[in-house]
C-alpha cells in the first residue's frame, strides 16, 4: 500500500501502525495516503525535523508509550490536516516553543503521562481550533496566566495528576466553551474566588484528591450548567451556606473523604436534578430536619462511615425519589419511628455496623418497596412483631452479628425467619447470644423450649401465624460469625473516562451487586 515499512502494518483504510521495541526511529517510507498513524511501544527517543513531511493527509497521529524525550520544533511540519495528536505515555520533560505551529486543524492534543515540568502561553498560542487538551499525569507545578488564552474553543481540559499547588484566578478566564475541567490529584489547598467564573458552559469539574480546605462561597456561582462536581478526598471541614446555590443542573456531587462535621441548613439546593450525593468518610455527627429537602430527585444518598449518632425525624424530608440510603458504620443507637416515613421509593437501606439496640415497629411502615435491609453488626436483641410483614419485595435481609436474645419473645421472629430463610442469604445466619445455654446456636432452628421464659409484653400485632416446631433439636454452633471488617480504602469516584467507573469495593457504601451496577 504505497510502500508500507516492514516494521509496520498498513490497512486499506489508510491506517498505519508501527509497534515493537526494535523500532528506534520513525519508519520510512510511510504511505503518502496515510490518514492515521500509530507509533506505539517502540524505543524511539527523539523526533527530528519533519519525519512526517510526505504524509500531509494525516488526520490522526498517535505516538504513545515510547521512550520519547526530545522533539525538534519542526517535527510536525506540513501536517495541516492533523486533527488528533497524542504524545501520551512518553518521557517528555520539555516542549519546544512552536512545536504545534501550523497544526491549524488540530482538535485533540494528548500530552498526558509524560514528565512535563512547565507549559507556557506560547506552546498553545497557534492551536486556536483545539477542543481537547490532556495534560494529566505530568509534573506541572503551576500554570502561568495566559497559558490557555488562545484556546477559546476548548471543551475538555485535563490537568489531573500533576503537582499544582495553586491556580491563578485568571488562568481559565477565556475558556467559555469548556465543558470538562479536571484538576484531580494535585496539591491544591485553596481555589481563589473567580477561578471558574468564565466557565459558563462547564458540565464537569473534578477537584478530588487535592488538599482543599476551604471553598469560597461564590466559587461555583457562574457554573449554571455544571452536572458533575467531584470534591472528594480533600480537607474540606465546612461548606459555606451558599456554595452550591447556583447549580440547578447538578446531578452528581461527591464529598466523601473530607472532614465535614455538619451539614449547614439549605446547603444542598435547590438542586432539582441531583441524583447522587456521596458523603461517606466524613465526621458528620447529626442530621437535622430538612437537610436534604431541596433534593427532590435524589436517588442515591451515601452517609456511611461518619459519626452520626442522631437523626432528626425530618432529616430525610423531601427525598421522595430516594432508592438507596447508606447509613452503615456510624454511631446510631436510636431511630425515631418517623425517620424513614417520607422515603416511599426506598429500595435498599444499609444500617449495619451501628449500635442500634431496637427498631421502632413502624420504622419501615411507609417504605413498602424495600428490597434489601442490612442490619448486621448492631446491638439488636429482638425485633418488633410484624416489622417486615408488609415488605413484599424484600429479598435480602442481613441480621447476623447481633446479640439476639432467644427467649420465648423471639418466637414470632424465629418463625418468620423460618419461612423467609432465602432472604437471609447463605453466608451468615443470625445466632443466639443469650441465654447462655443457647449462645451461638442458629436463631432459625433454635428450640426455644430450652430458653428462659420472657417477661416482655409485646405492644404491636404479631407476625403472621406460622407453625412453631417445638421438637426441633438444638444444634451445636456450626455457624461461624463472619467478620464485619470492611475494606477501608475509598472507592475511586473518578477515572479519566467520561463515565465514572466504580470498583467492586461495594462495602464502602453497603450496596449489593445490583445496586452498584
Amino acid at each position: 500500500y504505497h510502500g508500507c515499512p516492514s516494521e509496520c502494518t498498513c490497512s486499506r483504510a489508510s491506517q498505519v501502525e508501527c509497534t515493537g521495541a526494535r523500532i528506534v526511529a520513525v519508519p520510512t517510507p510511510l504511505p503518502w495516503n496515510a490518514m492515521s498513524l500509530q507509533i506505539l511501544n517502540t524505543h524511539i527517543t527523539e523526533l527530528n525535523e519533519s519525519p512526517f513531511l510526505n504524509i500531509s493527509a494525516l488526520i490522526a497521529l498517535r505516538i504513545e508509550k515510547n521512550e520519547l524525550s526530545r522533539i525538534t520544533p519542526g517535527a510536525f511540519r506540513n501536517l495541516g490536516s492533523l486533527r488528533y495528536l497524542s504524545l501520551a505515555n512518553n518521557k517528555l520533560q520539555v516542549l519546544p516553543i512552536g512545536l504545534f505551529q501550523g497544526l491549524d486543524s488540530l482538535e485533540s492534543l494528548l500530552l498526558s503521562s509524560n514528565q512535563l515540568l512547565q507549559i507556557q502561553p506560547a506552546h498553545f498560542s497557534q492551536c486556536s481550533n483545539l477542543k481537547e487538551l490532556q495534560l494529566h499525569g505530568n509534573h506541572l507545578e503551576y500554570i502561568p496566566d495566559g497559558a490557555f488564552d488562545h484556546l477559546v474553543g476548548l471543551t475538555k481540559l485535563n490537568l489531573g495528576k500533576n503537582s499544582l499547588t495553586h491556580i491563578s484566578p485568571r488562568v481559565f478566564q477565556h475558556l467559555g466553551n469548556l465543558q470538562v475541567l479536571r484538576l484531580y490529584e494535585n496539591r491544591l489547598t485553596d481555589i481563589p474566588m473567580g477561578t471558574f467564573d468564565g466557565l459558563v458552559n462547564l458540565q464537569e469539574l473534578a477537584l478530588q484528591q487535592n488538599q482543599i480546605g476551604l471553598l469560597s462561597p461564590g466559587l461555583f456561582h457562574n457554573n449554571h450548567n455544571l452536572q458533575r462536581l467531584y470534591l472528594s478526598n480533600n480537607h474540606i471541614s465546612q461548606l459555606p451556606p451558599s456554595v452550591f446555590m447556583q447549580l440547578p443542573q447538578l446531578n452528581r456531587l461527591t464529598l466523601f473523604g473530607n472532614s465535614l462535621k455538619e451539614l449547614s441548613p439549605g446547603i444542598f439546593g435547590p438542586m432539582p436534578n441531583l441524583r447522587e450525593l456521596w458523603l461517606y468518610d466524613n465526621h458528620i455527627s447529626s442530621l437535622p430536619d430538612n437537610v436534604f429537602s431541596n433534593l427532590r430527585q435524589l436517588q442515591v444518598l451515601i452517609l456511611s462511615r461518619n459519626q452520626i449518632s442522631f437523626i432528626s425525624p425530618g432529616a430525610f424530608n423531601g427525598l421522595t425519589e430516594l432508592r438507596e440510603l447508606s447509613l452503615h458504620t456510624n454511631a446510631l443507637q436510636d431511630l425515631d419511628g418517623n425517620v424513614f416515613r417520607m422515603l416511599a421509593n426506598l429500595q435498599n437501606i444499609s444500617l449495619q455496623n451501628n449500635r442500634l439496640r431496637q427498631l421502632p415497629g413502624n420504622i419501615f411502615a411507609n417504605v413498602n418497596g424495600l428490597m434489601a435491609i442490612q442490619l448486621q453488626n448492631n446491638q439488636l436483641e429482638n425485633l418488633p412483631l410484624g416489622i417486615f410483614d408488609h415488605l413484599g419485595k424484600l429479598c435480602e435481609l442481613r441480621l447476623y452479628d447481633n446479640p439476639w436474645r432467644c427467649d420465648s419473645d423471639i418466637l414470632p421472629l424465629r418463625n418468620w425467619l423460618l419461612l423467609n430463610q432465602p432472604r437471609l442469604g447463605t453466608d451468615t445466619v443470625p445466632v443466639c447470644f443469650s441465654p447462655a445455654n443457647v449462645r451461638g446456636q442458629s436463631l432459625i432452628i433454635i428450640n426455644v423450649n430450652v430458653a428462659v421464659p420472657s417477661v416482655h409484653v409485646p405492644e404491636v400485632p404479631s407476625y403472621p401465624e406460622t407453625p412453631w416446631y417445638p421438637d426441633t433439636p438444638s444444634y451445636p454452633d456450626t455457624t461461624s460469625v463472619s467478620s464485619t471488617t470492611e475494606l477501608t480504602s475509598p472507592v475511586e469516584d473518578y477515572t479519566d473516562l467520561t463515565t465514572i467507573q466504580v470498583t467492586d469495593d461495594r462495602s464502602v457504601w453497603g450496596m449489593t451487586q445490583a445496586q452498584s451496577g
Epitope: 455538619e262 439549605g266 447529626s286 437535622p288 430538612n290 425525624p313 424530608n317 431496637q358 415497629g361
Partner: antibody
Amino acid sequence: QVQLQQSGPELVRPGASVKISCKASGYTFTDYYINWVKQRPGQGLEWIGWIYPGSGNTKYNEKFKGKATLTVDTSSSTTYMQLSSLTSEDSAVYFCTKWGYGAWFAYWGQGTLVTVSS
Amino acid sequence: DIQMTQSPSSLSASVGDRVTITCKASQNVGINVAWYQQKPGKAPKLLIYSASYRSSGVPSRFSGSGSGTDFTLTISSLQPEDFATYYCQQYNSFPYTFGGGTKVEIK
C-alpha cells in the same frame, strides 16, 4: 390519638429534689423521642432535653446538665424528669412534648407547675 | 447557642387587623423553624412547622415564611380567639431555642 398526661403540681423546699412524670398513650411509646421544656412564670420557653424511651438514651441542653435527669419506665409508658438541688430559679411549669414528623413539638402535656419555696 | 430574637415583644391590634411577627436567628437555621400559640394557663399549640407549613387544624389565616435567618408569622385577619402569646423556635441544632415571645393584645 396521642396524649401526654403529666403529674400534678409540686411544692418543694429549696435544696430538695422533685420527680415529675409524663404518661404517654395513643402510640407506641418506645418508638419516639420525648422532650421536656421549661417555662418560668411570665417568661419564655427553654428546651431541657430529650429521652428515647426504647433505649433510655438522653440528650441535655448544657444549661440543664446536673439539674435535670430524664428516665423512663416502658412498662407504664411513662417518662420522668427529676430536678435536683432546687432553687427559686427552678420554679416553673415543665412540659413534656413529642415531636411530629420532624423535630417540632406537635404534642404537649398539660404542664406541671413546680414551686420552690421555703 | 442560636439566639432567636422575636419582635415586637407585644402589640395591640383589633379584630380583622393583619398582624406580622418576625423572628431573627443568630445564625442560619434553614427552614427549621416552628411557631406556637400559647394562651394563659395552657400548653403551647403548634401553628407552623418547617417555616411555612400549617399544622393540621390550624386556620388558613395563619401563615409562615422565611428561611436562613429571617422568619415571619402573619395572621391575615385577626380573630377574637387569636389574642395570645406567640413563640418561634429553631430546631436546626442543639440546644433547640425559642424566641422571647410576642404578646398580641386587644387594642
